[in-house]
């Protein structure tokens, strides 16, 4: 049941990326939606050896990752503002989970290149728009009402069955021929119906 609701929630969420609306907009798919979260892809040139990548939401630093090398060429990777991230030889992926409307915003990849020189900062970004489809909204509106109606019908059905059972029991106690009379009535009804058909 829980997993069903979770898949329904995933189905309801849609992510739309509006790129080209800002200077330095990403010329690649920056947002990848999966597993109820979003992977934000921040690319950098293959030649870059050492850098700092910051993920900005509006003007706020959400995540960062710094890659440097020591004098023995040993790599050090640090995060001051930790997010689940993944480093490849030309990109850093930051993962955001449990998406809701508050996540809709401009997201920027702020790349500071240390090596090779000269020191350079580049900013690329796009708009992450989270919306719910009309069908989904209708479903979300009618589903609880439908469930409530079903529960009410079930309760009423139970009450009715209980009431009928109780009535039947009480009538059979007062009239010993009650059951015989009931059977006769049913049989008569059957006969008349058959007559109707032959005519």
């Amino acid at each position: 049941m829980k997993s069903g609701l979770w898949y329904f929630f995933l189905f309801c969420l849609r992510i739309k990326v509006l790129t080209g609306e800002i200077n330095g907009s990403a010329n690649y798919e920056m947002f990848i939606f999966h597993n109820g979260g979003v992977q934000i892809l921040c690319k950098y040139p293959d030649i870059v050896q050492q850098f700092k990548m910051q993920l900005l939401k509006g003007g706020q630093i959400l995540c960062d990752l710094t890659k440097t090398k020591g004098s023995g060429n040993t790599v050090s990777i640090k995060s001051l503002k930790f997010c689940h991230s993944q480093l490849s030889n030309n990109s850093v992926s930051f993962f955001l989970y449990n998406l809701d409307h508050s996540h809709a915003n401009y997201y920027f990849c702020n790349l500071s290149i240390f090596d090779p020189p000269p020191f350079k900062v580049t900013l690329t970004g796009g708009y992450l728009h989270i919306y719910e489809s009309q069908l989904c909204c209708q479903l979300k509106f009618w589903l609880p009402i439908g469930c409530a109606a079903f529960v009410v019908v079930c309760i009423l059905g139970c009450i009715l069955i209980c009431w009928l059972t109780k009535k039947k029991y009480s009538s059979s106690v007062h009239d010993p021929n009650g059951e015989y009379m009931f059977m006769r009535a049913v049989n008569t009804a059957k006969k008349s119906r058959l007559t109707d058909v032959t005519l």
């Epitope: 090398k69 020591g70 004098s71 023995g72 050090s76 240390f114 090779p116």
Partner: antibody
């Protein structure tokens, strides 16, 4: 302006210990790997040790491994070199250097360590 | 460990003349598009100073008479027109892996 100032050098007997310090200023100390490089009188440069930005990675020259310990205090902008079991061959000027991503771009004036009985 | 060798041990050049220093590594210093080799200048009584990194890129403020070349295992530092202030010992250094090592140095004097 980047400044590195070493201190703690001096005369010590073989088998003795010494702790060198390097006070850094003029840059964000916690953003850089730092190294110690030494130079025996009239000789060439020899790399001793390095440490990454937060002190989680340290590396040592085979000549000093197990005897020397590099550390840093980013709150105090200071680099340290703890030298134990000193030998005559450790006599040298010890330079504190900043690894500027692709080379030692800043050097202190050095502090002389003399190991002699 | 990678062993760095330099030649010559010393050289004397007339003012305004070209000085050439060679450096050889015991294994290739090329990784990707970078040669992990730097050159330092050490004047008497002073700490070393970074001149060239990645074999051929001049550090900030270094005069353009200094140039670096080479790839793999063979590298060269050239002073196109020697000036009096260039009297120093020049060291090549690799940072290809740990431990980084320096060459023995080449002393440059004025003839």
């Amino acid at each position: 302006e980047v400044q590195l100032v070493e201190s703690g050098g001096g005369l010590v007997q073989p088998g003795g210990s010494l702790r060198l310090s390097c006070a850094a200023s003029g840059f964000t100390f916690s953003d850089y790997w730092m190294d110690w490089v030494r130079q025996a009188p009239g000789k060439g440069l020899v790399w001793v040790s390095n440490i990454d930005e937060d002190g989680s990675i340290t590396e040592y020259s085979p000549f000093v491994k197990g005897r020397f310990t590099i550390s840093r205090d980013n709150a105090k902008n200071t680099l340290y070199l703890q030298m134990n079991s000193l030998r005559a061959e450790d006599t040298a000027v010890y330079y504190c250097t900043r690894w500027g991503r692709f080379g030692f771009d800043s050097w202190g004036q050095g502090t002389l360590v003399t190991v002699s009985s | 460990d990678i062993v760095m060798t330099q030649s010559p041990d010393s050289l004397a050049v007339s003012l305004g003349e070209r000085a050439t220093i060679n450096c050889k590594s015991s294994q290739s210093l090329l990784s990707g598009s970078f040669n992990y080799l730097t050159w330092y200048q050490q004047k008497p009584g002073q700490p070393p100073k970074l001149l060239i990194f990645y074999a051929s890129t001049r550090h900030t403020g270094v005069p353009d008479r200094f140039s670096g070349s080479g790839s793999g295992t063979d590298f060269t530092l050239t002073i196109s027109s020697l000036q009096a202030e260039d009297v120093a010992v020049y060291y090549c250094h690799h940072h290809y892996n740990a431990p980084p090592t320096f060459g023995p140095g080449t002393k440059v004097d004025i003839k």
